[in-house]
């Protein structure tokens, strides 16, 4: 049955309340310089109106502060409001390293996120770090690696696992959770030109995940003991006709193509799913494509298999797709899917459909594929186009959180995190904030504090504290000495 | 490594028609744009135009949307330019050029040149 | 169209020198230029891109600066392979164009 009633319970006490943000673009100098300058000022108030220094006295100037970045301000008065636990962002490759290499590190820009992450951490707000966040319009890499081809240079990866090596290594004492790379298997929108660009680029991005993922666990966890995974693109797909074979098999051939072509070869084998290689190559025999999924060495299978933590997951919607052979030798045309747009479901501005049971079904569909194993909704939410009462928004939130949690008490789900999308709207972008695009807050900010305040949907008479485990008190102390530490 | 090879140089009558061709090796053919670029002595460097091979999409610059026209097969990894209806001001060398993915005007390899010479 | 303007047309220096070559674009292409080096004879070779990034190989007495309109390639300790023909490019938007060259020529 595709809807079932709603239920009664809670998330566990653990359990990540989140908001996500894309890339945060760093300040490069703190907005407050008035606390840095040692001179004495008079103003001439009624005459040039100008100020002019009075030689001879030097003031006591005090440090700089995180909180003289002024964006960072905004940023905790909007989390604050959200009462969320983990607050995801990402990291703007281009401006910690703009050579692509390690020969000039951009140290404004790593002090400006080492300071979102510890102010955050100051409200009890823990931070989910993504390392790389290319969208459609930015591919977000530093000019020297998109000037050598990108994602198609395998060189890329090499200065992937540099940058995340820096990036553990200043940040990491903070971080906890770590996200390498969000949604690369939506990069085939921008290698799109042949089949063979696509599959090329996201082995890379493979290898570049799964090299960071090796330097972390060699390096890094013994003394940081955080988890890294990548954020994969996670929407269900459902037949268009129920009643058509082709259907339900196209449905299947959507999340092979979508999501187990990245999730295979890191939670399971190590290489692309068989069903997809198999489906490509049957093409290529009949002459309908020129595409071939690349062929992993015994290395590379190594390299790849087992590098994640946790399995993190974008999901938005529920496509409905059908059956249609296409000839072409692209990634779109290799799948034989074409979409249908449901006019009696409830959509968004964007034409997101609502199908709140899209979402359990996935994670079902995850955990029956990769095992069971800890699952973080790393990005779900929808565009709304209110400014204040965004009811299509609560509505949203309220009925797939419904379905997560029936993912968690009824199958039994590992689900350890919900982090809504997102934090703040952009200029002239579908609105999905919290927020607009000019800090105003809207009533879903409520809705949402509701339930984390009562951890999702309990009886009437059930109790929605925690109690504060002597671990988590100690965990709190370390981070408060690793703040105050010079 | 990638390497553009074009073909010789030609002596040409005014009014005729010419095809320089410009065989791509190592690298996916279909998925960058082949730059054409004509230099005249004295005259610099000029952008005629560009193809991608695997969707036959052309762009061209003004001036040359009637004196040349792109091909390319991409079974043989060859880009075409073919210039018609030649006069004197078309003696120049011309070049092909492969682009960045990302950046196609950046141009990182180019053919040896081939000399086009326009005399009756 | 975007006009790329190098106004020296010949530059006259010795081994061991360091010279600037100049370019000016017609409108903003922020740092979408490359440079790049032709001797006589030969095709073009890349040498710096996005303003001033030096193309792998490149030796670093090359560089590059600048955005928006201004551009300037400096070669720092000349040396007598360096005599050849300097083009800007911008690759911003298309129609991508040249500047008209600046010869270097060692005394």
């Known amino acids: 049955k595709e809807s079932t009633p709603d239920v009664q319970g809670q998330f566990p006490c653990d359990f990540s309340w989140g908001v996500t943000e894309s890339v945060l673009k760093p300040e490069s100098v703190a907005s407050s310089p008035q606390f840095s300058d040692p001179h004495l000022y008079v103003w001439n108030a009624t005459g040039n109106r100008l100020l002019h220094r009075v030689e001879g006295v030097r003031l006591k100037t005090r440090p700089a502060q995180c909180t003289d970045f002024v964006n960072i301000k905004k940023q905790l008065e909007m989390l604050a409001r959200m009462k969320v636990t983990h607050y995801r962002f990402a990291l703007d490759w281009a401006s910690v390293l703009p050579t692509g290499n390690l020969s000039a590190v951009n140290r404004q820009a790593l002090r400006y996120y080492r300071c979102v992450v510890s102010e955050g951490l100051k409200l009890g707000i823990s931070a989910m770090v993504t390392l790389y966040y290319p969208t459609h319009a930015h591919l977000g890499l530093p000019e020297p690696l998109l000037h050598a081809d990108g994602w198609l240079n395998p060189s890329t990866a090499e200065a992937f696992q540099a940058y995340a090596g820096l990036c553990f290594q200043e940040l990491g004492d903070l971080v906890k959770l770590w996200i390498t790379i969000n949604e690369p298997n939506r990069l085939s929108d921008i290698y799109n030109r042949s089949g063979n660009d696509t599959y090329g680029a996201a082995h890379n991005l493979l290898v570049a995940h799964a090299l960071a993922w090796r330097l972390y666990d060699r390096q890094f966890r013994p003394s940081q003991r955080g988890a890294v995974s990548l954020s994969l693109h996670a929407d269900w797909a459902e037949p268009a006709n129920p009643y058509a074979d082709s259907h339900w098999r196209a449905a299947e051939r959507f999340l092979q193509f979508e999501i187990a072509w990245f999730a295979e070869p890191l939670f399971k084998t190590g290489d692309y799913p068989a069903a997809m290689r198999e489906y490509i190559a049957s093409k290529h025999r009949r002459g309908l494509s020129s595409s071939a999924l690349p062929r992993l060495t015994e290395a590379e299978r190594r390299l790849l298999k087992g590098t994640v933590d946790f399995c993190a997951l974008n999901h938005f919607t529920t496509r409905f797709v059908m059956h249609e052979q296409l000839a072409g030798s692209r990634y779109d045309s290799d799948r034989d899917i074409q979409f249908l747009q449901d006019i009696t479901r409830l959509s968004s501005p964007t034409r997101l459909a609502v199908i709140p049971w899209g979402v359990r079904k996935l994670l079902r569909w995850v955990r029956r594929n990769y095992g069971d194993m800890d699952i973080y909704i790393t990005a779900s939410g929808i565009d709304d186009q209110a400014l204040e009462d965004d009811r299509l928004r609560k509505y949203y939130l309220g009925k797939y959180l419904q379905e997560v949690l029936k993912a968690y008490l009824i199958d039994k789900v590992r689900i350890k995190g919900y982090y809504a999308f997102k934090l703040a709207e952009e200029k002239s972008k579908p609105r999905f904030g919290f927020f607009t695009s000019d800090f105003k807050a809207k009533s879903s900010i409520q809705f949402y504090n509701k339930v984390i305040s009562s951890r999702g949907f309990p009886f009437e008479n059930s109790s929605s504290r925690c109690s504060q485990t002597q671990e988590n008190t100690e965990c709190t102390v370390c981070l408060f000495l690793v703040q105050k530490k010079p | 490594q990638v390497q553009l090879q074009q073909s010789g140089d030609e002596l040409m009558k005014p009014g005729a028609s010419v095809k320089i061709s410009c065989k791509v090796t190592g690298n996916t053919f279909s998925s960058y744009w082949i730059e054409w670029v004509k230099q005249r002595p004295g005259h610099g460097l000029e952008w005629i135009g560009e193809?991608?091979?695997?969707?036959?999409?052309?762009k061209y610059v003004e001036k040359f949307k009637v004196k040349a026209t792109f091909t390319a097969d991409t079974s043989s990894n060859t880009a075409y330019m073919q210039l018609s209806s030649l006069t004197s001001e078309d003696s120049a060398v011309y070049y092909c050029?492969?682009?960045?993915?990302?950046?196609?005007?950046?141009?990182?390899?180019w053919g040896q040149g081939t000399l086009v010479t326009v005399s009756a | 169209d975007i006009v790329m303007t190098q106004s020296q047309k010949f530059m006259s220096t010795s081994v061991g020198d360091r010279v600037s070559v100049t370019c000016k674009a017609s409108?903003?292409?922020?740092?979408?230029v490359a440079w790049y080096q032709q001797k006589a004879g030969q095709s073009p070779k890349p040498l710096i891109y996005s303003a001033s990034y030096r193309f792998s190989g490149v030796p670093d007495r090359f560089t590059g600066s600048g955005s928006g309109t201004e551009f300037t390639l400096t070669i720092s300790n000349v040396q007598s392979e360096d005599l050849a023909e300097y083009f800007c490019?911008?690759?911003?938007?298309?129609?991508?164009?040249f500047g008209g060259g600046t010869k270097l020529e060692i005394k």
């Open positions: 193809i991608l091979p695997g969707s036959d999409s052309t």
């Open positions: 050029a492969r682009g960045g993915y990302h950046y196609p005007g950046w141009l990182v390899y």
């Open positions: 409108q903003n292409v922020d740092s979408y």
């Open positions: 490019q911008q690759y911003n938007i298309s129609p991508y164009t």
